[in-house]
């Protein structure tokens, strides 16, 4: 058993049929010695008396809010949550495996630039009695500070018969150094509590590996005189790190015909303009990636050719 | 470069960008194995990193690029020695068309651009981890290449910025 926060305790249980469970001793936080009784949740049933209560925690029915009383007055509370371990593996019932970039990916994180700011998100099908808390640091043995904001419900989607909820959090490294080479990874720890079930999820990454620029902005097409060719230009997204002579992007451009089956030629360039043949019903698209480190490509920015 | 002269920024820019491409060809798989789980924070601590105080940020380069260039050169020599060691020559076998060979040569080429003959900055001692098992060797290879990708990305930014803003 360990203390999650004041008056909230997590009991770690090996979860299998007829498991013996854990013996837990609760102590009433009071100078009083006599006439103390214990109850669980809203049930008025007295579970025991005395300053301490010893219980065998085996299942969710044994978890909940234990209260010690004297003379009808509550003296202190202890909330017991269960953390299940099945076959040596902690349960992951609350969050959905996003399976990208690999199996057992429960938390996904992205950064738009090298400022030390990043967003993480996760998915669940649970809609009620659910709370999350997030902690983050750089490195684990000698952690450096990362400050995370409040967790928000950022999207709801219908997936077949189920509703899926996406939660997200924004974090900022306290003293980021955008130009340096990261040596220690960022660690993100999410505690999830659903009713009386406790689970924790972690992710470890370098900012450089989760970079995904915003799409290029200000796409413009300028037809060239007496030619089927068009001069296309675009700009770095506003959210990208500066100066651009240092934090450079590379671009992938393509002209896509109306039919999805039509062959599209992709051209890679470090410039912010190009000359292409842009037919009437086609569209021109461009995406960006860090020029020197192969992290994610941005989403496409597109403009019709006509 | 030693003694305060300027490097051939444009040449360094070209070669460092080529290094980035080669480093990713040699080990393209991001997240293919979570290498940090194996041995965690200490494993690549002995490789040189370009850190916050090394003057490799745009402001630091403007003030005095020498500190940063010295740091980059130390790292290039370190990695060049590693890529020539039996970590990369032993099993699992690398084919002669492996980008590692070109990477090795390009690291040497860029370090020489930063230090013409006759000048000798002190370089740090190169560790010689020589694992005997193919599995350990392969894991170390992957770690070195992932770490090199990050190092040459910073070096390439430095030279791109230098070529754009510091060239005479």
């Amino acid at each position: 058993i360990w203390e999650l926060k004041k008056d909230v305790y997590v009991v770690e249980l090996d979860w299998y049929p007829d498991a013996p469970g854990e013996m837990v001793v609760l102590t009433c936080d009071t100078p009083e010695e006599d006439g103390i009784t214990w109850t669980l949740d809203q049930s008025g049933e007295v579970l025991g008396s005395g300053k301490t209560l010893t219980i065998q925690v085996k299942e969710f029915g044994d978890a909940g809010q234990y209260t010690c009383h004297k003379g009808g007055e509550a003296l202190s509370h202890s909330l017991l949550l269960l953390h299940k371990k099945e076959d040596g593996i902690w349960s992951t019932d609350v969050l959905k495996d996003q399976k990208e970039p690999k199996n057992k990916t429960f938390l996904r994180c992205e950064a738009k630039n090298y400022s030390g700011r990043f967003t993480c998100w996760w998915l669940t099908t649970i809609s009620t009695d659910l709370t999350f808390s997030v902690k983050s640091s750089r490195g684990s043995s000698n952690p450096q500070g990362v400050t995370c904001g409040a967790v928000t419900l950022s999207a709801e989607r219908v997936r077949g018969d189920n509703k899926e909820y996406e939660y997200s959090v924004e974090c900022q490294e306290d003293s980021a150094c955008p130009a340096a080479e990261e040596r220690l990874p960022i660690e993100v720890m999410v505690d999830a509590i659903h009713k009386l079930k406790y689970e924790n999820y972690t992710s470890s990454f370098f900012i450089r590996d989760i970079i995904k620029p915003d799409p290029p902005k200000n796409l413009q097409l300028k037809p060239l005189k007496n030619s089927r060719q068009v001069e296309v230009s675009w700009e770095y997204p506003d959210t990208w790190s500066t100066p651009h002579s240092y934090f450079s992007l590379t671009f992938c451009i393509q002209v896509q015909g109306k039919s999805k089956r039509e062959k599209k030629d992709r051209i890679f360039t470090d410039k912010t303009s190009a000359t292409v043949i842009c037919r009437k019903n086609a569209s021109f698209s461009v995406q960006a990636q860090d020029r020197y480190y192969s992290s994610s490509w941005s989403e496409w920015a597109s403009v019709p050719c006509s | 470069v030693p003694g305060g002269s300027s490097p051939a920024w444009a040449q360094c820019q070209q070669l460092s960008q080529k290094l980035c491409t080669l480093a990713w060809s040699a080990h393209p798989l991001v997240g293919h194995m979570d290498l940090r789980e194996e041995g965690d924070e200490e494993t690549t601590n002995d490789v040189p990193h370009i850190q916050c105080g090394d003057g490799c940020d745009p402001q630091g380069l403007r003030d005095n690029s020498q500190f940063c260039l010295q740091r980059i050169r130390q790292g290039l020599i370190f990695y060049e020695k590693l890529l020539g060691s039996d970590i990369f020559t032993g099993e699992p076998s690398l084919l002669p068309d492996s980008p590692v060979g070109q990477l090795h040569a390009s690291l040497l080429g860029l370090s020489q651009l930063l230090q013409p003959e006759g000048h000798h900055w002190e370089t740090q001692q190169i560790p010689s981890p020589s694992p005997s098992q193919p599995w350990q060797r392969l894991l170390l290879r992957f770690k070195i290449l992932r770490s090199l990708q990050a190092f040459v990305a910073v070096a390439a930014r430095v030279f791109a910025h230098g070529a754009a803003t510091l060239s005479p």
Epitope: - | L29, P92, P99
Partner: antibody, heavy 120, light 107 residues
Framework: QVQLVQSGAEVKKPGSSVKVSCKAS????????IHWVRQAPGQGLEWMGY????????KYNENFKGKVTLTADKSTSTAYMELSSLRSEDTAVYYC?????????????WGQGTLVTVSS | DIQMTQSPSSLSASVGDRVTITCKAS??????VAWYQQKPGKVPKLLLF???TRHTGVPDRFSGSGSGTDFTLTISSLQPEDLADYYC?????????FGQGTKLEIK
């Protein structure tokens, strides 16, 4: 896109030689090793060796030394595999293949195979 | 030379079955193992490399595991088009060697 096109099937007499070609396109010929793999009828795969066109250096599986000669013609982007002193047990499909760009020998692209039949 | 011993040499399974093929190397090859599928009369096709990394376009019902000397190819839910011979291949040490193959038949 990368393509490896091999020469057609051959029927040869025991004791003679055969030269199988593998014409490459879609990549820089001198940048990649070209490997040869044999598959006898109803049997598994056997790696024979490779040629590196950049410096014309071959590497052979010891089991095929003296039996096989690997060469390359940079001007036509073609690799050749010559088998000498043919015997009936050399009857097989011979494939050329090129590995991944990262320098390890897993084979991504294969030629269509050339059946060499040795029969008197 | 490193021997790659593949088992079973043939197996018959029904559509939807989970199928496992194993390969044992005669000495440590780290994870330098690839798996190929060869359909009747066709050229071998790369499925996995580094023991577990799926090649582009390979369905995710194919997965691999193992390191050192013991390797496994698993097809989680057999499809009719999976009828083929399967080969493991070590590329750790010269000469590169293949397993003798597993013939997979659909019941």
């Amino acid at each position: 896109q990368v393509q490896l096109v091999q020469s057609g099937a051959e029927v040869k007499k025991p004791g003679s030689s055969v030269k199988v070609s593998c014409k490459a396109s879609g990549f820089t010929f001198t940048d990649q090793t070209i490997h040869w793999v044999r598959q006898a009828p109803g049997q598994g795969l056997e790696w024979m060796g490779y040629i590196y066109p950049r410096d014309d250096s071959p590497k052979y599986n010891e089991n095929f030394k003296g039996k096989v000669t690997l060469t390359a013609d940079k001007s036509t982007s073609t690799a050749y595999m010559e088998l000498s002193s043919l015997r009936s047990e050399d009857t097989a499909v011979y494939y050329c293949a090129i590995p991944d760009r990262s320098g390890y020998a897993w084979f991504i692209y294969w030629g269509q195979g050339t059946l060499v039949t040795v029969s008197s | 030379d490193i021997q790659m011993t593949q088992s079973p040499s043939s197996l018959s399974a029904s559509v939807g079955d989970r199928v496992t093929i194993t390969c044992k190397a005669s000495r440590d090859v780290a994870i330098a193992v690839a798996w190929y599928q060869q359909k009747p009369g066709k050229v071998p096709k790369l499925l996995l490399f580094w023991a577990s990394t799926r090649h582009t376009g390979v369905p995710d019902r194919f997965s691999g595991s193992g390191s050192g000397t013991d390797f496994t190819l698993t097809i989680s839910s057999l499809q009719p088009e999976d009828l083929a011979d399967y080969y493991c291949h070590q590329y750790s040490s010269y000469p590169f060697t293949f397993g003798q193959g597993t013939k997979l038949e659909i019941k």
